[in-house]
């Protein structure tokens, strides 16, 4: 089902407006901000979620990098331009005509420029490293149990096939989750690793995007896993293009 028929809500995206005006009176949901129809049986794209977040009333508001080309989302929130499929447009601009190129997860990958800036293609983020530090516990978590629970979580809650969870590393108190998904691997219907990572990030921060479900209650063999810090690194299929000035800053 595309949405919860009984009360016409979107289980996977609470930042939607839903009404029974779809074919045959079916519940249809549209993302806030963009008005685009969303498939409520799967995750909504990060671009549409960011756009919805920027349109909503404002409320109070990252170990070693995997490579020198890893990106961290230092720019924070912005109101993105999304394409008709809900993906980020390769070029993003703000109201003051400052433009920049982004990757498939919407993170800036070039210096900022003006309206003449060209972004030829949307470069895919194929490797995401989620770096977590958990709160002190009586003892370390069992690595195998932790690996299994995180894979289960990504499969069941975020609908990400475990084949895209390349590895789970653990050196107490640091947990690293590696998500990998090459263009050739991603089949129609597969959740994008960028979307799964964004939902996970919001869950970890206590800002769940799910409608009517409780927040994330992460447990490993019954022991609560409480995260106190999150850093996410993004690696693109083509390295980013920043000036030396930025790299040495």
């Amino acid at each position: 089902h595309t949405a919860a028929q009984d009360n016409c809500t979107c289980p996977t995206n609470k930042m939607t407006v839903c009404s029974p005006d779809g074919p045959g009176g079916r519940c249809q949901c549209r993302a806030l901000g963009s008005g685009m129809a969303v498939d409520c049986s799967t995750l909504t794209s990060k671009c549409l979620l960011l756009k919805a977040r920027m349109s909503a009333p404002k409320n109070a508001r990252t170990l070693v990098r995997p490579s020198e080309h890893a990106l961290v989302d230092n720019d924070g929130l912005y109101d993105p331009d999304c394409d008709p499929e809900g993906r980020f447009k390769a070029r993003q601009c703000n109201q003051t005509s400052v433009c920049w190129c982004v990757n498939s997860v919407g993170v800036r990958r070039t210096d900022k420029g003006d309206l003449s800036l060209r972004c030829d293609e949307l470069v895919r983020t194929h490797h995401i490293l989620i770096d977590l530090r958990h709160r002190p516990t009586a003892g370390a978590f069992n690595h195998s149990d932790l690996d299994a629970e995180l894979r289960r979580l990504f499969r069941e809650r975020y609908r990400l096939h475990p084949k895209f969870v390349a590895a789970v590393h653990y050196e107490q108190p640091t947990i690293q989750i590696e998500l990998r998904q090459n263009t050739s691997q991603k089949a129609a219907g597969d959740v994008d690793i960028g979307d799964a990572a964004y939902y996970f990030e919001r869950d970890i921060k206590g800002e769940s995007l799910f409608q009517g479900r409780g927040g994330l209650d992460l447990r490993v063999r019954g022991e609560p896993l409480q995260v106190e810090r999150t850093l996410i690194y993004y690696l693109d299929e083509i390295p980013p293009k920043f000036s030396m000035k930025r790299l040495t800053a």
Partner: antibody, heavy 119, light 111 residues
Framework: QVQLVQSGAEVKKPGSSVKVSCKAS????????INWVRQAPGQGLEWMGV????????SYNQKFKGRVTITADESTSTAYMELSSLRSEDTAVYYC????????????WGQGTLVTVSS | DIVMTQSPDSLAVSLGERATINCRVS??????????MHWYQQKPGQPPKLLIY???NLESGVPDRFSGSGSGTDFTLTISSLQAEDVAVYYC?????????FGQGTKLEIK
């Protein structure tokens, strides 16, 4: 302990439908998807489909598309598999099986339900 | 669909001897070093039982005489010292992509 308990054997006429239930206990039902697998007499195992107990939707083996419907009732921790337009070659033992934690392996299985299709 | 081919179809091994079952897959089931290949044991009148997951990981409670190896497209289940209770049909299964598929089974008997 984790248990999957299935409904009893059924005898059905060709062209009719059958609905097999699988009641789960010993774990949080919505934490693990449930698969259905069948085994014809003296034959191997054949995956039919899987339901996300968290979302309530299913994906199916194309071979059965249009004939099989997998549902779940969170309130009773029960999954169901309905197969329609039955034919004699659908005579088989039908199993429900839970996904394991990490790699989509099937770690717990129901005891099986024999469905016999005969005129 | 991914095709799984087990060999041999049947196998007779003496008690205490080594039994080896092979499974060849039509395309790789490896993803970043994780092989989505599992082995099950099925005894008459019973449901299958998970023995090995991710090609080589022993499921909890399974005797350590069972082991799995291989990667990509070629996998092996080994029973190091056959016991009487190991008489069963053994199946390999891939969960890399749906439809998830099983091998045709290998019947293991005592010689």
């Amino acid at each position: 302990q984790v248990q999957l308990v299935q409904s009893g054997a059924e005898v059905k006429k060709p062209g009719s439908s059958v609905k097999v239930s699988c009641k789960a206990s010993g774990y949080t039902f919505t934490d693990y998807s449930i698969n259905w697998v069948r085994q014809a007499p003296g034959q191997g195992l054949e995956w039919m489909g899987v339901i996300s107990t968290y979302y309530g939707d299913a994906s199916y083996n194309q071979k059965f598309k249009g004939r099989v419907t997998i549902t779940a009732d969170e309130s009773t921790s029960t999954a169901y598999m309905e197969l329609s337009s039955l034919r004699s070659e659908d005579t088989a033992v039908y199993y429900c099986a839970r996904y394991g934690d990490g790699y989509n392996q099937f770690d717990y299985w129901g005891q099986g339900t024999l469905v016999t299709v005969s005129s | 669909d991914i095709v799984m081919t087990q060999s041999p179809d049947s196998l007779a091994v003496s008690l205490g001897e080594r039994a080896t079952i092979n499974c060849r897959v039509s395309e790789s089931v490896d993803s970043y070093g994780n092989n989505f290949m599992h082995w099950y044991q099925q005894k008459p009148g019973q449901p299958p039982k998970l023995l090995i997951y991710r090609a080589s990981n022993l499921e909890s409670g399974v005797p350590d005489r069972f082991s799995g190896s291989g990667s990509g497209t070629d996998f092996t289940l080994t029973i190091s010292s056959l016991q009487a209770e190991d008489v069963a049909v053994y199946y390999c299964q891939q969960s890399y992509e749906d439809p998830y598929t099983f091998g045709q089974g290998t019947k293991l008997e005592i010689k």
